[in-house]
Interface confidence: medium
């Protein structure tokens, strides 16, 4: 969590934002709430990017204002215009890029004052396991797979009932690249799993750590996944 | 408990066209591997087909493929064989199995439905 | 595809006697096998899988052994209920799925 405060004094309003993650190719939010002011057109909104030259985004008077917005933002920006009456002044990024990552400043003005806070972006690629049992092997194997992922994460097993246990000489994970070129598609194998047990498929890199669990007995086969987004930090 | 209960059976002339059901309770239908396994009269058992949990695979004994087609629908808890050009030699007893937790082996089966196909 | 074979044919045991089943595939299956009875008029029931592993509610009179290519049922002392046809099958490499030709168990 980031507060930032107007500089100076009794004109400064708070400012918060939410470090998150973008997952690139698809739209992303960059979060900032601010004390409102009960008219729309006193309130002007300015995100900028650092190492960029124009703004990424700028609202006033109740309109969107895009003159000065640098060309790497154009058309793939917007606020929520009906939100911002009561203090939201988050931007909605259209398909976001891996060069979308960095350090961005929310910059507010009301009729009570001005302030601003910083939050940091990453971008990457992360998407949600599956894990299935794979009848087409020779021996009890399960198969965990996850479409897109960037950077490369890391993939561990784990087991309900053998907990602590290595899983990394009976597993073995592989990365194939996707026809973008940048995000990869993860598939790793578990062999000689037992019945009456569940497994978890952990997948992690720095932005975000997803899980499959897949709980398999003869009378049901019951999957799960879980998607968390790392440093998630409010400001 | 598990419960398989095969449908469609009878007596259908060499050509013509009958589908089976098998109606599934007591274990989560969506999450399984499904099978039919027939039985010619006096005869050994004999694998026919398999479908994926999400239907999106289908695997055939040589003998019925081009000719049969294994379907499912999760939302009934219903599996189907739809069978095609029937010949004397598929006249049998046709068995729904559920496969094992792990593997295909066949940890439930139904009671049968027998398809006689003559003229 | 894997071809099972299965011997003897038929078994003539008096109860309360062993019987001892045989199985065997035209290659390598690893555990990969399946131990099946049937009775007169009703579906099969499984016995047996990964070639020793007793299916739920299983009396503790049947067993499974080998591993490769060589495979036996054990029914270590033969009950009124125990005579029937039985079939191994395996699922190591598929399709096809494959069975044996069975072995029918008789009263001597």
């Known amino acids: 969590l980031i507060i930032g405060f107007g500089i100076s004094g009794r004109h400064s309003i708070t400012v918060t934002t939410v470090a998150s993650a973008g997952n690139i190719g698809e739209d992303g939010i960059l979060s900032c709430t601010f004390e409102p002011d009960i008219k729309l057109s006193d309130i002007v909104i300015q995100w900028l990017k650092e190492g960029v030259i124009g703004l990424v985004h700028e609202f006033k008077e109740g309109k969107d204002e895009l003159s000065e917005q640098d060309e790497m933002f154009r058309g793939r920006t917007a606020v929520f215009a009906d939100q911002v009456i009561v203090g939201n002044a988050s931007l909605r990024l259209k398909n976001v890029q891996l060069t979308d990552a960095g350090t961005y400043k929310c910059y507010i003005i009301t009729s009570k004052g001005k302030g601003n806070a910083n939050l940091e972006y990453k971008t990457g690629a992360f998407s949600m396991p599956e894990v299935n049992v794979d009848y087409n092997a020779s021996s009890e194997t399960l198969r965990c797979e996850a479409p897109r992922w960037f950077p490369q994460p890391t993939v561990v097993w784990a087991s309900q009932v053998d907990q602590g246990a290595n899983f990394s000489e009976v597993s073995n994970t592989s990365f194939e690249l996707n026809s973008e070129n940048v995000t990869m598609k993860v598939v790793s194998v578990l062999y000689n799993v037992t019945i009456n047990n569940t497994y978890s498929c952990m997948i992690e890199n720095d932005i975000a750590k997803a899980t499959g669990d897949i709980k398999v007995t003869e009378s049901e086969i019951k999957r799960r996944s879980h998607l968390q987004l790392l440093n998630s930090k409010a400001s | 408990q598990v419960q398989l209960v095969e449908s469609g059976g009878g007596v259908v002339q060499p050509g013509r066209s009958l589908r089976l059901s098998c109606a599934a309770s007591?274990?989560?239908?969506?999450?399984?591997?499904m099978h039919w396994v027939r039985q010619a009269p006096g005869k050994g058992l004999e694998w026919v087909a398999v479908?994926?949990?999400?239907?999106?695979?289908?695997y055939y004994a040589d003998s019925v493929k081009g000719r049969f087609i294994i379907s499912r629908d999760n939302s009934k808890d219903t599996l189907y064989l739809q069978m095609n050009s029937l010949r004397a030699g598929d006249t049998a007893v046709y068995y729904c199995?559920?496969?094992?937790?792990?593997?295909?082996?066949?940890?439930?089966w139904g009671q049968g439905t027998l398809v006689t196909v003559s003229s | 595809e894997i071809v099972m074979t299965q011997s003897p044919a038929t078994l003539s045991v008096s109860p309360g006697e062993r019987a001892t089943l045989s199985c065997r595939a035209s290659q390598s299956i690893s555990s990969n096998l399946g131990w099946y009875q049937q009775k007169p008029g009703q579906a099969p029931r499984l016995l047996i899988y990964g070639a020793s592993t007793r299916a739920t509610g299983i009396p503790a009179r049947f067993s499974g052994s080998g591993s490769g290519t060589e495979f036996t049922l054990t029914i270590s002392s033969l009950q009124s209920e125990d005579f029937a046809v039985y079939y191994c099958q395996q699922y190591n490499s598929w399709p096809p799925l494959t069975f044996g030709g069975g072995t029918k168990v008789e009263i001597k």
């Open positions: 479908i994926s949990y999400d239907g999106s695979n289908e």
């Open positions: 007591g274990f989560t239908f969506r999450s399984f591997g």
């Open positions: 199995a559920k496969g094992g937790g792990l593997r295909w082996y066949f940890a439930y």
